[in-house]
Amino acid sequence: LMGGQDKPFLSARPSTVVPRGGHVALQCHYRRGFNNFMLYKEDRSHVPIFHGRIFQESFIMGPVTPAHAGTYRCRGSRPHSLTGWSAPSNPLVIMVTGNHRKPSLLAHPGPLLKSGETVILQCWSDVMFEHFFLHREGISEDPSRLVGQIHDGVSKANFSIGPLMPVLAGTYRCYGSVPHSPYQLSAPSDPLDIVITGLYEKPSLSAQPGPTVQAGENVTLSCSSWSSYDIYHLSREGEAHERRLRAVPKVNRTFQADFPLGPATHGGTYRCFGSFRALPCVWSNSSDPLLVSVTGNPSSSWPSPTEPSSKSGICRHLH
């Protein structure tokens, strides 16, 4: 982590990807400690705060503006050397987001995947972005970068993620950058939750009063398991959003969640999954599918069982 003998290590916290108006601390680690250091910005855009200044421990930059985007290096204090300073550190790229319209992010074949599969995350925009960046929330390392391909007035890049393991599950966002300003990134795409299934035993799914009901009759789907899942997720075939509920321990030592669907009008095929609070994006195997059938004349379509979840709602704890 620390680089060469005479080379300090420059790092940023909380992240190298910083929104306009955010703050970032640059830390220059040298010779087993934080000594005095100087900061350099490698490109031509002038950041006057660094001119001839010496910093201790860390330098806090902010509120950041597009001019702060770029490559930084530091030199550590070395009093007994000829120059008084170390060799330059590793280059550290600070990317500033929020400078262009957000791109779109899609998952192919979809955001719900089995362990071991590969997913393509496609970032695209009608802004002619030269590069696209993909970033997973909570990861401190630099985002993946791809050159944008331009076809029919759309620029896009396909990021291949896989084979999928629990560590790759989470909330992804992508950004674009235009030529000549490679580190001034767009606003983030809407978040996309990548969920990995198939890691734990499947729960069981049942319907009350039963899987075949009269039109207008109230239906509740119950998901349960002997495994101590914290959350259950209910999905309906053909619908993008899932619904989730906290699992409740029952007297028979199972863990259960009851999803009220309201008055039945149209049927559908349902599945449920279990997950643990510590890994909200890693789900169990799917329950066996449950086909809910409605007899009689439905007057309108069944109310969606899943009011759309918040934009990045799946990979978040349920409180």
């Epitope: 108006g21 955010g22 703050h23 601390a25 902010g62 509120p63 503006t65 929020g98």
Partner: antibody, heavy 120, light 107 residues
């Protein structure tokens, strides 16, 4: 001690403009960014934008981009906000606030507020 | 833009009660969160910054906690002067949005 003194209440007609001030004292004006916050009657707080008095760099909430112009006079340690094309919806209390220092800074000092009433 | 969802929007409590107000960000804000108290006709006053740090002069009955997207302001034992409106605000990139506010009233 740090103080932010704002100009007095204003009553304006729709379509007019107004320029309000925030005079800073007790600290180095150019070392901190100055922010503006709006509060409509009975409503919550809305961030309008900020100016870095040292560089003149400004950034606005998109919602107020065409409405506000932020400036600063370093010789008098005063920040200004001009609101144009006033409408009744601009009736509010406008606060200036200093953004503190550190990695996780808050608005550590606030002005007392300038009440703007827009009415025909 | 980051949305800040504050709950509850109003709360009735008695002197001596323990009160908790929560604020949820639409994405990780890395503890870039402040809490303010506002009384009628007055400017907001800083209570807590960096999610957990008490501002100078703020009584120790106030405390902040949380990280990532979820944050809490707790008043351990309500005093008569604590009845006011409370706001959270994030600083992880502009616009620095506020929560909708929580009006704390005497029961």
């Amino acid at each position: 001690q740090v103080q932010l003194q704002q100009s007095g209440a204003e009553v304006k007609k729709p379509g007019a403009s107004v320029k309000m001030s925030c005079k800073a004292s007790g600290y180095t004006f150019t070392s901190y960014t100055m922010h503006w916050v709006r509060q409509a009657p009975g409503q919550g707080l809305e961030w309008i934008g900020y100016i870095n008095p040292s560089s003149g760099y400004t950034e606005n909430n998109r919602k107020f981009k065409d409405k506000t112009t932020l400036t600063a006079d370093t010789s008098t340690s005063t920040a200004y906000m001009e609101l144009s094309s006033l409408r009744s919806e601009d009736t509010a209390v406008y606060y200036c606030a200093r953004l503190g220092k550190g990695l996780l800074p808050p608005f550590d000092y606030w002005g007392q507020g300038t009440t703007l009433t827009v009415s025909s | 833009d980051i949305q800040m969802t504050q709950s509850p929007s109003s709360l009735s409590a008695s002197v001596g009660d323990r009160v908790t107000i929560t604020c949820r960000a639409s994405e990780n804000i890395y503890s870039n969160l402040a809490w303010y108290q506002q009384k009628p006709g007055k400017a907001p006053q800083l209570l807590v910054y960096a999610a957990t740090n008490l501002a100078d002069g703020v009584p120790s009955r106030f405390s902040g906690s949380g990280s990532g997207t979820d944050y809490t302001l707790t008043i351990s034992s309500l005093q008569p002067e604590d009845f006011a409106t409370y706001y959270c605000q994030h600083f992880w990139g502009t616009p620095y949005t506020f929560g909708g506010g929580t009006k704390l009233e005497i029961k």
